[in-house]
Interface confidence: medium
């Protein structure tokens, strides 16, 4: 004769408030004859959850028809779950006896816990921009999950980060928990197009983690490099001077030309191009009139980038006597 086994396959059952929970229990033998009852807890203080023969259990229904002769499935459904329903549930086999049935065997128990999904992680970066090679901090927060066990990982683009600190609150028992993590990220010059990703894994997510992202473009400032050059070719009686502002981010930039210390108001031609790394190049052309009276012309290209202190580059204009002679003869 096969020994009776009480099978409760789930050690832990995560349920949501208001939903229906299914507690599984199957037996491996029809013998001994006698009923199967459901209890929450163990010992003398255990609470009867379901008895097919007697009592009124309005929230409990059976999965199978227990009146069928060969039924071996004693699973139940409990509807409208509340926080008061948490605990460990046991299905227990009783042997028919006189004057009363005798407990024969208990299942291993299924712990019912309230499972709540974590909220979508929110990643916040620094309040102010920082230049490459410096470290910036990002925080990631997710709330409202249960049980407390949770895994959080940080990535920069495809690479996992290791420099972070994580806290789960509260430390004691609670209906729901929150996680907060702070990661330290060293900025690279090409990080305008980079992302930091906070990934949260929890039992309620069934292996599909939640992700929050932040763009490093919000955190980085790449300061420009300046170069001022005089073009060898002349246009009539004018010399073309170029100011190249390279590899800057963000796009916010003010460029002014000054001639011997005097700011020039006139229009200058310029182009803006984007580099593959997301930084920008700005080229400005300035035409200077050549005349006999102009011996020493110092041109300054001044750039104010993203509200920072202005940087400038100067160029002493080289005008040969030959060029002057030509320009004085040239017709406008």
């Amino acid at each position: 004769e096969e020994e009776l086994q009480m099978i409760q396959p789930e050690k832990l059952l995560l349920v949501t408030v208001g939903k229906t929970a299914t507690l599984h229990c199957t037996v491996t033998s029809l013998l001994p004859v006698g009923p199967v009852l459901w209890f929450r807890g163990v010992g003398p203080g255990r609470e009867l959850i379901y008895n097919q023969k007697e009592g009124h259990f309005p929230r409990v229904t059976t999965v199978s028809d227990l009146t069928k002769r060969n039924n071996m499935d004693f699973s139940i459904r409990i509807s409208s779950i509340t926080p008061a329903d948490v605990g460990t549930y046991y299905c227990v086999k009783f042997r028919k006896g006189s004057p009363e049935n005798v407990e024969f065997k208990s299942g291993p128990g299924t712990e019912m816990a309230l499972g709540a999904k974590p909220s979508a992680p929110v990643v916040l970066g620094p309040a102010a921009r920082t230049t490459p090679e410096h470290t910036v901090s990002f925080t990631c927060e997710s709330h409202g999950f249960s049980p407390r066990d949770i895994t959080l990982k940080w990535f920069k683009n495809g690479n996992e980060l290791s420099d972070f600190q994580t806290n789960v609150d509260p430390t004691g028992q609670s209906v729901a928990y929150s996680i907060r993590s702070t990661a330290r990220v060293v900025l690279d010059p090409w990080d305008v197009r980079s992302q930091v990703i906070c990934e949260v894994a929890h039992v309620t997510l069934q292996g599909d983690p939640l992700r929050g992202t932040a763009n490093l473009s919000e955190a980085i400032r790449v300061p420009p490099t300046l170069e001022v050059t005089q073009q060898p070719m002349r246009v009539g009686n004018q010399v073309n001077v170029t100011c190249q502002v390279r590899k800057f981010y963000p796009q916010s930039l003010q460029l002014t030309w000054s001639e011997n210390g005097n700011v020039c108001q006139r229009e200058t031609a310029s182009t803006l191009t984007e580099n593959k790394d997301g930084t920008y190049n700005w080229t400005s052309w300035f035409l200077v009139n050549i005349s006999d009276q102009r011996d020493d012309v110092v041109l300054t290209c001044q750039v104010k980038h993203d509200g920072q202190l202005a940087v400038s580059k100067r160029l002493a204009l080289e005008v040969t006597v030959h060029q002057k002679d030509q320009s004085s003869d040239a017709t406008p």
Epitope: N157, G158, R193, S194, Q195, T273, K276, D277, Y280
Partner: antibody, heavy 126, light 106 residues
Framework: QVQLVQSGAEVKKPGASVKVSCKAS????????IHWVRQAPGQGLEWMGW????????NYAQKFQGRVTMTRDTSINTAYMELNRLRSDDTAVFYC???????????????????WGQGTMVTVSS | DIQMTQSPSTLSASVGDRVTITCRAS??????LAWYQQKPGKAPKLLIY???SLETGVPSRFSGSGSGTEFTLTISSLQPDDFATYYC????????FGQGTKLEIK
Amino acid sequence: QVQLVQSGAEVKKPGASVKVSCKASGYTFTGYHIHWVRQAPGQGLEWMGWINPNSGGTNYAQKFQGRVTMTRDTSINTAYMELNRLRSDDTAVFYCARERVGYCSRPSCLDDLNIWGQGTMVTVSS
Amino acid sequence: DIQMTQSPSTLSASVGDRVTITCRASQSISSWLAWYQQKPGKAPKLLIYKASSLETGVPSRFSGSGSGTEFTLTISSLQPDDFATYYCQQYDSYYTFGQGTKLEIK
């Protein structure tokens, strides 16, 4: 799945312009640069330039500077390439292609192209 | 500009053969090289990136090697589906393609 679908074949007269579209699906359009490559009949592949769909920023090969314009419409996940002042030697298949990596993993940020459109044949003939 | 030179321009081979295509860069490009396969009327298909990394879904009979200026694409045992034109592409500084190698049935 990830794919790029291009507009149909075009026949144009010399001096005219052509605008080819490239509709992206199956991925975040703004996360990856779109490149344009052309191939004349029986010839090799020639890179024309790229557009950053996120910012609209562009970078063109020197050969096409001043004649090509790349734009995008993020609301419909579509990139466009317009070539002006067409000549008979512009007759070619034009491909759009997406880079494999959507972020910068090294200083130059350049990357290989793993998703290609089916190509658009542009014939320039008087 | 970086120039890419492929050799040979045409290669005749039989099913089961081991074939090698060479690509030379006019200056060092580290490992920033990709190999593409193109069939008539179709778009190029990425086979190898970063000189030796096999793209997902590409059969393992394809392999790439080299760094600096000399690179090779090897097909260990040629299959009927492999007859096509192969292009190398550098992406160290902008993008340049080789002129292509047409692999045809002997």
